[in-house]
Interface confidence: low
């Protein structure tokens, strides 16, 4: 995207304006750059999934048949405008909401290119004050948009169809020189404006379509679907330096935050002050001789605080998330300078109350000491506050680095990202993905449980109309009870005419069993809400019992286990619903419907309408687990 | 079976030192802080301070500051807590106890108690 | 440091009572409050943590409420299992401290 002007620059704004900020370092180090960016990965599993749920070979539909894909990057204005402040053109104050009718406006820029990301294997978009203008202001008398976008439908349908390997777009603040902390708040304004990765593909009839949302009114043979993915964080919140660490040590601007504000040169009165130790050593800021006051101060920039009686004084890390135990504040202080204050360090987890971390001093060198305070892998996404509380006339304080260490185990935890899927009907009512082919109609014309469904690969969708679905039985010798799929024809059955999967446990000698397998279902998506959806039913006296076991392939190894169980049942003959989450499946699995009965028993067993929830395959959820708060 | 064992009852003559030890069994003893406690019939339960058993880092009440120190041996899974210049005042019951490094702010489980007698 | 004040200092109550346990902080703890329970031979036990929620293995007889700075402790059946001293503790602020405790008797 293009590269836009310094906001100190822009044009129109006052020639008499604030003193110029001392320049950032041109090139911030690749992981500073990196801890800016805003990364969206989708897996390669989606693209695998969706290709073989969704997209049949081109060869085996008509052109105009054939499935469509987009894609785009969305992100608000409001917080990209508010950074830019008030600019020419711009028909309501980046302070202030936009219009009711301007917030659905969105105007759009041009993504990347195919060619970039086949070169790359991933897309980078810098977006800068220029981009913002361009995006949220457009030309003069026009009306500003509630909603910035980057078209990115060439690229999204490239890779669902052609693509390989994970889909990974890179939002990132435009590099170029400009005043201090330039790339930091514009990184936080990206964020703030929620940017989120949408996705949509949709089943076409006989005509193309021009517009996903502009449905022809739908006649019985016109066939079509409509599914929608927003990749966003589940926490927008939530500093992106919490994948590696935070590691300030006040040479460079950091992301966070002071109370009071952090000094600037028109507010002489300073309290938190950002200077270089070779200022301090000649300023008459510590007691005793000259050459002792150099020594003690570390090289490079540190905090100093300047504070008045009986104040208080905070520095704030960004919103962050840890997977380790071990996760741990760390702050340098010099202890002669702050005789007469102390620190208290405090624990803000989102959404619950506010608690002090114990501080354990370290002795360093020189009079500075290590604070250090255990913080452990608290459930919900934090912050953590260093306070500073003066008890006394006048008191100094230097603060030379601020860390959090030790928050990562393995993967990283920093923001999760979720891709939430959803179902569109046609008359535009928006059901969640698993609602779709799940045997229960949703939408008002029933499109949620149509073509579609039925060419989900087998097994994922029966309704045993077409025979087993892929269900299947060893070698049995005539003997043998058999599960067989036929109608229930029997006056009992009047509101149930259709095939299901039976079995009859005919009263036997000794005791029987019989196993039905399914045929084998990928592995689900890690963190995907994945559920299995029955009917069943059992009729007359059953003196034994019914498993259903999931097995998975692990290793070559096969390891089952019971997913759902009944015994020694009476059957009132009425169809019962069942939705089984199928949680930690992490590999290929097949499912059986193990039956055992013995003397006595006089059932029969049915299944009906059996499917897999397209949420297993095309659903990420934002969590591992659900959040909850701790003691 | 989880425990926090604590040293036996000690008499000793004021101005002197003590060291009373706490041992843990039935859990990993660097994943939790051990907290030292008094109990008198004057100021009741009162927050000593506490080490971290990992790094040997300690924090301390401020009214203890000088008159507790806290260690920790790793190998033994043992906590320690020496007590300087005793007088009567120091004369009560001593607890250790145990707590999560995050999330928590409860002592989960506590030693028996240990009885100090300051006296001439 | 933040004050626990506990009230009362003991009662009586016989066997199958409910008995109720207050106790206040100066100031906001955020629902960082814990009840224990102290046996005549010195035995320290977490009964609840932050505010409500029941430690492993204690009586579903036992529950606490509050927020803010008030706080409650609540045994529904008195035992007789249940004669010792009660303190409650806030851990929303260093030190953490302690209630007087009430003293429960039969």
């Known amino acids: 995207v293009g590269s836009g002007m310094g906001t100190g620059q822009r044009a129109g704004s006052p020639a008499a304006g604030p003193p110029l900020q001392p320049r950032e370092p041109l090139s911030y180090s690749r992981l500073q750059r990196k801890s800016l960016a805003v990364d969206f990965v989708v897996p390669s599993l989606f693209r695998v999934y969706a290709r073989d749920l969704l997209l049949p070979p081109s060869s085996s539909e008509l052109k105009a048949g054939r499935p469509e894909a987009r894609g785009s990057l969305a992100l608000d204005c409001a917080p990209l405008l508010r950074l830019l402040g008030p600019a020419p053109g711009v028909s309501w104050t980046a302070g202030s909401p936009a219009p009711a009718e301007a917030r659905t406006l969105s105007r759009v820029l041009k993504g990347g290119s195919v060619r970039k990301l086949r070169r790359a294997k991933q897309l980078v978009l810098e977006l800068g004050e220029e981009a913002i203008l361009e995006g949220c202001v457009g030309p003069p008398g026009e009306a500003a948009v509630g909603l910035l976008q980057f078209n990115l439908s060439e690229l999204f349908s490239w890779w669902i169809r052609q693509g390989e390997g994970r889909l990974r777009i890179r939002l990132m603040p435009e590099k170029k020189a400009s005043e201090v902390g330039r790339e930091g708040r514009l990184s936080a304004a990206i964020r703030a404006s929620q940017p989120r990765l949408l996705f949509q593909i949709f089943g076409t009839g006989h005509s193309s379509l021009e517009s996903p949302t502009n449905m022809p009114s739908p006649s019985p043979d016109y066939f079509t679907w409509n599914l929608t993915w927003i990749m966003k964080d589940s926490f927008p919140f939530l500093s992106h330096r919490s994948r590696y660490g935070l590691e300030c040590s006040f040479d460079f601007p950091c992301e966070l935050e002071y109370s009071p504000p952090l000094h600037d040169l028109r507010n002489q009165s300073w309290s938190w002050r950002r200077i270089p130790s070779e200022e301090a050593s000649q300023m008459d800021l510590l007691d005793g001789p000259g050459a002792e006051r150099s020594k003690e101060m570390p090289r490079g920039s540190f905090l100093l605080l300047n504070t008045s009686a009986d104040s208080k004084h905070t520095i704030l890390s960004p919103w962050m998330r840890s997977s380790s135990e071990h996760c741990t504040l760390a702050v340098s202080v010099h202890r002669h300078l702050q005789p007469s204050g102390r620190y208290i360090a405090q624990l803000l987890p989102h959404n619950e109350a506010a608690r002090e971390i114990l501080l354990m001093p370290t002795p360093g060198k020189h009079g500075w000491t290590v604070l250090q305070g255990r913080i452990g892998r608290p459930d919900n996404p934090f912050r953590v506050a260093l306070e500073y509380i003066s008890s006394g006339n006048r008191s100094l304080s230097a603060v030379d680095f601020f860390a959090l260490k030790n928050c990562s185990e393995g993967t990283s935890p920093g923001s999760k990202m979720a891709l939430q899927s959803s179902f569109t009907c046609w008359n535009g009512t928006v059901l969640q993905l698993g609602q779709a082919c799940d045997f229960h109609q949703d939408c008002a014309q029933g499109e949620d449980e149509s073509q579609m469904c039925r060419k989900l690969p087998v097994g994922f969708y029966c309704n045993f109309e077409d025979g087993f679905c892929g269900w299947t039985q060893g070698t049995l010798s005539p003997h043998t009870p058999q599960w067989q799929v036929r109608t229930l024809k029997d006056a009992r059955f009047q509101d149930h005419q259709d095939h299901a999967l039976l079995l009859s446990t005919t009263d036997v000698p000794a005791s029987e069993s019989a196993t039905v397998t399914s045929a084998t279902f990928p592995a689900p998506i890690k963190s995907s809400p994945c559920e299995l959806r029955m009917s069943w039913l059992i009729r007359g006296v059953l003196r034994g019992n019914v498993s259903l076991v999931l097995v998975e392939n692990k290793t070559g190894k096969e390891q089952g286990r019971m997913v759902w169980h009944v015994a020694a049942y009476e059957g009132l003959s009425l169809w019962q619903w069942m939705v089984l989450p199928l949680l930690d499946v992490s590999d290929r699995f097949w499912l059986q419907m193990v039956a055992w009965w013995g003397q006595g028993s006089r059932a029969i067993v049915a299944f009906d309408n059996i499917s897999i929830s397209l949420d297993c395959y095309l659903t990420i959820s934002g969590e591992d687990k659900i959040l909850q708060n701790t003691a | 079976a989880l425990q926090l064992q604590q040293s036996g009852a000690e008499l000793v003559r004021p101005g002197a030192s003590v060291t009373l030890s706490c041992k843990a069994s039935?859990?990993?003893?660097?994943?939790?802080?051990m907290h030292w406690v008094k109990q008198t019939p004057v100021h009741g339960l009162e927050w000593i301070g506490a080490?971290?058993?990992?790094?040997?880092?300690?924090a301390y009440n401020q009214k203890f500051e000088g008159k507790a120190i806290l260690t920790a041996d790793k190998s033994s899974s043992t906590a320690y807590m020496e007590l300087r210049s005793l007088t009567s005042e120091d004369s009560p019951v001593y607890y250790c106890?145990?707590?999560?490094?995050?999330?928590?702010?409860?002592?989960?489980?506590w030693g028996q108690g240990t009885t100090l007698t300051v006296s001439s | 440091d933040v004050q626990m004040i506990q009230t009362p200092s003991s009662l009586s109550a016989s066997l199958g009572d409910r008995v109720t346990i207050s106790c206040r902080a100066s100031?906001?703890?955020?629902?960082?409050l814990n009840w224990y329970q102290q046996k005549p031979d010195g035995t320290v036990k977490l009964l609840i943590y932050?505010?409500?929620r029941l430690h492993s293995g204690v009586p579903s007889r036992f529950s606490g409420s509050g927020s803010g700075t008030e706080y409650s402790l609540t045994i529904s059946n008195l035992e007789q299992e249940d004669i010792a001293t009660y303190f409650c503790?806030?851990?929303?602020?260093?030190?953490?401290?302690f209630g007087g405790g009430t003293k429960l008797e039969i």
């Open positions: 100031q906001d703890i955020g629902n960082y």
């Open positions: 932050y505010t409500s």
């Open positions: 080490i971290d058993p990992e790094t040997g880092g300690t």
């Open positions: 106890a145990r707590r999560r490094y995050y999330g928590s702010s409860s002592f989960d489980y």
């Open positions: 039935g859990y990993t003893f660097t994943d939790y802080e």
């Open positions: 503790q806030q851990g929303s602020a260093l030190p953490p401290t």
